[in-house]
């Protein structure tokens, strides 16, 4: 914003109140400039002279009109698991958010304070509800017919190929082996997605099949950060 | 591009109260006043009051204090004016206006919300 | 609070015609806070001129504006038809901002 223009304090009329981007001044008994976003106040306004404005020093801010005699300085720099995605400058304070694959698990006026890595599903889970920017990964067993043989913060459970002739019966970590004669499916084949805004899609690998350990009923695990809950791994 | 939305067309009864807002697009919503006036039919413009979203200050006129409410949610740019115990003579376009920032000119303006008060 | 009065408070003017409206304040005014908006049927008022004398975006350079202290006024150097609209000035000298009345200009 451009700085304001020059003009004299002046006394409001009785049952009038200052100009907008000017204050009171209960000293001076008068209505003074504000100094604009990028300033503060150097030199307070006196009856016959107005408000001072300075530029704020590297490092500090003003992001409102203001009559503040220092600038705010800015926050700390991003740690590694953050990205800056607002720079310090003398109108803004920095902005850190969490990087892809990671959320944020403790948030500030403005950016994140804390980000932690979000869940992956192991094999025999599937995501139930995606991880967001301020939530983490939640994760569900594969119902019956159902799979998913990766660990991954953004597969879901995949239904098991349909076989004329089974080889192998599925589980809920791996997918049905057939015999030799073409197999239909109950859905296009491949992996299946959810959208993931904050999270890189994870590499598909065929790990040995293992049986699943999750139990029969399907359930939701607890959001938030936590230990790793059955179902999930860590980093 | 600078863009003030206004919210519908309103018709009220008298003594009922309603909320108009107006969602700024397109510059920092903190950093300008924002801006309420009242055009009756054939008639001429007459300020209600401002809100700087950045800190909440508002400033009202006498005559529409204790009948307008300024509000504003940094979260969704938007500024609301809230208006209560309307009567006939409430019975106007609305606009909210943006503050240029420098000579006090009102440099946008939304489309403007009608309100219609009517037994 | 400070009081704007407009005059004429509806004119007519033909095509080419040079055209002045003036706008007249109770108490001094600074040419920086003295305003000019443009409001045709159905639509919402435009900053025109600002500070007295300067254009806002867009607007034709027939129009000027000029004045001080307690008398201004705003100035068409050749009348076209889409002109025609109500012309309001506006003070921010002193709280409150008022507005003049307005001026309705038509084409004869």
């Known amino acids: 914003l451009p700085a304001q223009v020059a003009f004299t304090p002046y006394a409001p009329e009785p049952g009038s109140t200052c100009r907008l981007r000017e204050y009171y001044d209960q000293t001076a008994q008068m209505c003074c400039s504000k100094c604009s976003p990028g300033q503060h106040a150097k030199v307070f306004c006196t009856k016959t002279s107005d408000t001072v404005c300075d530029s704020c020093e590297d490092s500090t801010y003003t992001q409102l009109w203001n009559w503040v005699p220092e600038c705010l300085s800015c926050g700390s720099r991003c740690s590694s698991d953050q990205v800056e995605t607002q720079a310090c400058t003398r109108e803004q304070n920095r902005i850190c958010t969490c990087r892809p694959g990671w959320y944020c698990a403790l948030s500030k006026q403005e950016g994140c304070r804390l980000c932690a890595p979000l869940r992956k599903c192991r094999p025999g889970f599937g995501v139930a509800r995606p991880g967001t920017e301020t939530s983490d990964v939640v994760c569900k067993p594969c119902a019956p017919g159902t799979f998913s043989n990766t660990t991954s913060s953004t597969d879901i459970c995949r239904p098991h190929q349909i076989c004329n002739v089974v080889a192998i019966p599925g589980n809920a970590s791996m997918d049905a082996v057939c015999t030799s004669t073409s197999p239909t499916r109950s859905m296009a084949p491949g992996a299946v997605h959810l959208p993931q805004p904050v999270s890189t899609r994870s590499q598909h690998t065929q790990p040995t099949p293992e049986p699943s350990t999750a139990p029969s009923t399907s359930f939701l695990l607890p959001m938030g950060p936590s230990p790793p809950a059955e179902g999930s791994t860590g980093d | 591009e600078v863009q003030l939305q206004q919210s519908g067309a309103e018709l009220a009864r008298p003594g009922a109260s309603v909320m108009l807002s107006c969602k700024a697009s397109?510059?920092?919503?903190?950093?300008?006043?924002m801006q309420w006036l009242k055009q009756r039919p054939g008639q001429g413009l007459e300020w209600i009051g401002a809100i700087y979203p950045g800190d909440g200050d508002t400033r009202y006129t006498q005559k529409f204090k204790g009948k307008a409410t300024l509000t504003a949610d940094k979260s969704s740019s938007t500024a609301y004016m809230q208006l209560s115990s309307l009567a006939s003579e409430d019975s106007a376009v609305y606009y909210c206006?943006?503050?240029?920032?420098?000579?006090?000119?009102?440099?946008?303006w939304g489309q403007g919300t009608s309100v219609t008060v009517s037994s | 609070q400070i009081v704007l009065t407009q005059s004429p408070t509806i004119m007519s003017a033909s095509l080419g015609e040079r055209v002045t409206m003036t706008c007249t304040a109770s108490?001094?005014?600074?040419?920086?806070?003295l305003h000019w908006y443009q409001q045709k049927p159905g639509s919402s008022p435009k900053l025109w001129i600002y500070?007295?004398?300067n254009l806002a975006s867009g607007v034709p350079a027939r129009f000027s504006g000029s004045g001080s202290g307690t008398s201004y006024s705003l100035t068409i150097s050749s009348m076209e038809a889409e002109d025609a609209a109500t012309y309001y000035c506006h003070q921010y000298h002193r709280s409150p901002p008022t507005f003049g009345g307005g001026t309705k200009l038509e084409i004869k």
């Open positions: 397109g510059y920092t919503f903190t950093s300008y006043w």
């Open positions: 500070s007295t004398s």
């Open positions: 206006v943006r503050d240029d920032g420098l000579y006090y000119a009102m440099d946008y």
């Open positions: 108490s001094s005014v600074s040419s920086s806070y």
